[in-house]
């Protein structure tokens, strides 16, 4: 019972975590204009992994996609990659863990197979969570070290560099969403790994009685027949999941030019 609860809870926590990682990756507010000690301006700038936005006091929001790959900083590309890898691994982990859930019966799947799959999904969740935490942390570090470039032209203005009133950026909501989501995915993965140990059939000692036809004495032989734990080469695990996950639908697509909200 405790194993099922641990596995179910691990699954739910990971599901929430991965949803959070997807949300954070899609969010525009990775960095937001630092309003502290700045002149009061009638525009508010914020930037995400995929586009930068400007919200005007009058009520209009204009977002511009980063229509370049080569022009973007390597760090931004790295953060994108980490988040996408986290989403892909998390999505695969979720798919695997659905089949691994003890409460779901799929044919005559053995507990050993379920234990294997639980462990696999747990490891995937852990790596997914670490990827998200790493991605968010790299971006946060980039913000701290730059306090966002004196030119304020990091990857929005690819054209001429115009000296402007310096716009400084600070941590956006997406960073906190990403950290929490990554942490939840990590915790969910650990819970799945713990549940895996409970799912694996334990070592059982069967008392073997040996009868000797010639003699009258009966000898009891404490012999051990090891039950398969599911991790050895003798397991009858079938390949349940192929491991190919698509990411196109995981990240929302953005308008091609200007998006006025």
């Amino acid at each position: 019972m405790a194993v099922t609860a641990c596995q179910g809870l691990g699954f739910v926590v990971s599901l929430i975590g991965i949803a959070g990682i997807i949300a954070a990756t899609c969010m525009d507010q990775w960095s937001t204009q630092d309003l502290y000690n700045n002149p009061v301006t009638a525009v508010f700038n914020y930037q995400g992994l995929w586009r930068s936005c400007v919200r005007e006091s009058s009520g209009f929001t204009e977002c511009r996609g980063y229509f370049t790959l080569l022009g973007l900083p390597a760090m931004l590309q790295a953060v994108r990659a980490l988040m996408i890898v986290g989403i892909v691994l998390g999505a695969i982990g979720l798919l695997v863990s659905i089949f691994a859930l003890k409460c779901i019966r799929i044919g005559s799947m053995e507990d050993s197979a379920k234990a294997n799959m639980t462990l696999t999904s747990g490891i995937m969740f852990i790596v997914s969570g670490l990827c998200a935490i790493a991605g968010v942390s790299v971006f946060a570090n980039m913000l701290v070290t730059n306090f966002w470039m004196s030119t304020a032209n990091m990857y929005t203005g690819m054209g001429g560099m115009v000296q402007t009133v310096q716009t400084r950026y600070t941590f956006g909501a997406a960073l906190f969403v990403g950290w929490v989501a990554g942490g939840l995915t990590l915790i969910g993965g650990v819970m799945m790994c713990i549940a895996c140990r409970g799912l694996a059939p334990e070592e059982t000692n069967y008392k073997a009685v040996s009868y000797h036809a010639s003699g009258h004495s009966v000898a009891y032989k404490p012999g051990g027949f090891k039950a398969s734990t599911g991790f050895g080469s003798n397991t009858k695990n079938k390949k349940i999941y192929d491991g190919g996950a698509r990411t196109e639908d995981e990240v929302q697509s953005y308008p091609s030019k200007h998006d006025y909200v």
Epitope: A42, N45, E56, T156
Partner: antibody, heavy 117, light 113 residues
């Protein structure tokens, strides 16, 4: 279509409080901001302040202590209150809708306020 | 507060002539986030409320004739009327729409010779 109409008292005594209401139609105050501008006779434009969609306000720093801008979204009305009036506050008072670039794309016809005893 | 300085204060031109008026701000009105200048031009004819001509320093408001062109960046801006018409007789104001409080220039009065 978008319309703004100011309604004011016309004549106000010095040291009294001016109250002007701007009634809007054709757009929602929950989506767009409204700004106030005044123009003394024969002079230039002076920005008084604004109330934005979210309800936050900004004021002309020279008039901040005397100005209050508020709104009633359900009635589609924005009100401007200015206390301690003097003859220098005699002007045409305009309300205008905020547009792209924080510019004022639609204006009311204005209401003339004369401060005199 | 941002100071907006307009020059000249008045202009007398002939119909069909090209006219240029300037506006200078005490601080850059360029927003780095979208590389747009928050400078607006208004036209005010006698007895009427101001009318929006140009926003973002160079974007014409819909319905504004294309003889009106806004240009400039940072602190220096220009409004050009390529061929002055009789109906262009008005006072033209520039406005800072970037820093609070928003501020207007003193205006340029366009008169017909």
């Amino acid at each position: 279509q978008v319309q703004l109409k100011e309604s004011g008292p016309g004549l106000v005594a010095p040291s009294e409080t001016l109250s002007i209401t701007c009634t809007v139609s054709g757009f929602s105050l929950t989506t767009y901001g409204v700004q106030w501008v005044r123009q003394p006779p024969g002079k230039g434009l002076e920005w008084l302040g604004a109330i934005w969609a979210g309800g936050n306000t900004n004021y002309n720093s020279a008039l901040m202590s005397r100005l209050t801008i508020s709104k009633d979204n359900s009635k589609s009305q924005v009100s401007l209150k200015m206390s301690s009036l003097t003859a220098a506050d005699t002007a045409i008072y305009y309300c205008a809708k905020g547009g792209y670039g924080n510019a004022m794309d639609y204006w009311g016809q204005g209401t003339l306020v004369t401060v005199s005893s | 507060d941002i100071v907006m300085t307009q020059s000249p204060s008045s202009l007398a031109v002939s119909l069909g002539e090209r006219v240029t008026m300037n506006c200078k701000s005490s601080q850059s009105l360029l927003n780095s986030g979208n590389q747009k200048n928050y400078l607006t031009w208004y036209q005010q004819k006698p007895g009427q409320p101001p009318k929006l001509l140009i926003y973002w320093a160079s974007t014409r408001e819909s319905g504004v004739p294309d003889r009106f062109t806004g240009s400039g960046s940072g602190t220096d801006f220009t409004l050009t009327i390529s061929s002055v018409q009789a109906e262009d007789l008005a006072v033209y104001y520039c406005q800072n729409d970037y820093f609070f409080p928003f501020t207007f220039g003193s205006g340029t009065k366009l008169e017909i010779k």
